[in-house]
């Protein structure tokens, strides 16, 4: 008589029984391992920096203007400075350098601190240009804006950028820009390869 509920005949060799007894914990272990592995992978994905996922992004605030004869604006970024950050791109002497090829949204706003509508027109031309300034072989203007009657300009555009491109923001004219973080800022966002 077979033992009740054993599922194994006493007279037969218990291969099926042994196999079943071994397979059940093995399958259970594999399932648990799979669940744990998926959870850990998901956590690892969440903890990965944005740049490793391809989402290179930077938002910068004005640090200072250049010395005489240097029209460039010098930028700074980082959590300690407030609402500015760099994930992927980096700053090289206050200029933004791209680390990943792709199409980027480039945006900028600049407000002049010493300015009125009459000043802006009187001190014409005051212009802001954003461009690739190095390497020299890729040098090109990406954005050009003029302060005609106002004290603030803002613009954005999509443009392809390559690893190693350094973006420069040139402010020409005699009007001092504001360093207020809600008035003057510059950033890029990777959109697609």
């Amino acid at each position: 008589m077979p033992e009740e509920g054993s599922g194994c005949s006493v007279r037969r060799r218990p291969y099926g029984c042994v196999l079943r007894a071994a397979l059940v914990p093995l399958v259970a272990g594999l399932v648990i391992c799979l669940v744990v592995c998926i959870q850990r992978f998901a956590q690892a994905q969440q903890q990965l920096p944005l740049e490793s996922l391809g989402w290179d992004v930077a938002e910068l605030q004005l640090n200072h203007t250049g010395p005489q004869q240097d029209p460039r604006l010098y930028w700074q970024g980082g959590p300690a400075l407030g609402r500015s950050f760099l994930h992927g791109p980096e700053l090289d002497k206050g200029q933004l350098r791209i680390h990943r090829d792709g199409i980027y949204m480039v945006h900028i706003q600049v407000t002049l601190a010493i300015c009125s509508s009459t000043t802006a027109s009187r001190h014409h031309p005051t212009t802001l240009a954003v461009g690739i300034c190095s390497p020299a072989s890729r040098s090109i203007s990406l954005l050009r804006l003029s302060f005609h009657q106002g004290c603030t300009i803002a613009s954005q555009r999509l443009t392809p950028l390559a690893r190693g491109d350094t973006l420069c923001t040139n402010l020409t004219g005699t009007l001092l820009p504001s360093r207020n973080t809600d008035e003057t800022f510059f950033g890029v966002q990777w959109v697609r390869p």
């Epitope: 010395p67 000043t119 001190h123 001092l176």
Partner: antibody, heavy 120, light 109 residues
Amino acid sequence: EVQLVESGGGLVKPGGSLRLSCAASGFTFSSYSMNWVRQAPGKGLEWVSLISSSSRFIYYADSVKGRFTVSRDNAKKSLYLLLNSLRAEDTAVYYCARGDYSNYPYFDYWGQGTLVTVSS
Amino acid sequence: EIVLTQSPATLSLSPGERATLSCRASQSVRSSYLAWYQQKPGQPPRLLIFGASSRATGIPDRFSGSGSGTDFTLTISRLEPEDFAVYYCQQYGDSPALTFGGGTKVEIK
């Protein structure tokens, strides 16, 4: 503690020259625009000049344009004002004043001032 | 050049009273970019208010600024003995002429 100390004032004849200095301490001098503001005896305040942190942007009041020259040495944390072709109406206490970090030209810290007297 | 006119030239009040000082610009001052300073005899000016209504660091809340366009006001809600001084408004919305008003003297009645 932010400190601004002016020096170089004194008695000078009309047409003469003088160089004022302002020694700064207690803050990152190279990050701030700096200004000169003057006050004639018993009168109100008159802004004279502004120089940006990197010296790229320099502004003067019309009354001193072409006669006064502002400069700074960030390494020495010093601000200067060279006064040429002095007139009797330039007689005043000259204050060195720090501009706001935002670059907006209002003056959050002032020195005690140095007196310039132009008289024959 | 923007001209700032302060009124009254002199304000005679007692401690505990409210002081209202006016500053009028000859043309609109950009986005309320106007400052107020206090000056006591033999001392340099002290920044009280910037951006027309923002109190500078360490300034007591009895000082308040308001206004926009061409009309601005400095209010001292309850005068303390140390508040008797000369007050100047300054505009910094135009360049290169950053101008001060002629001042209002707040004296003890």
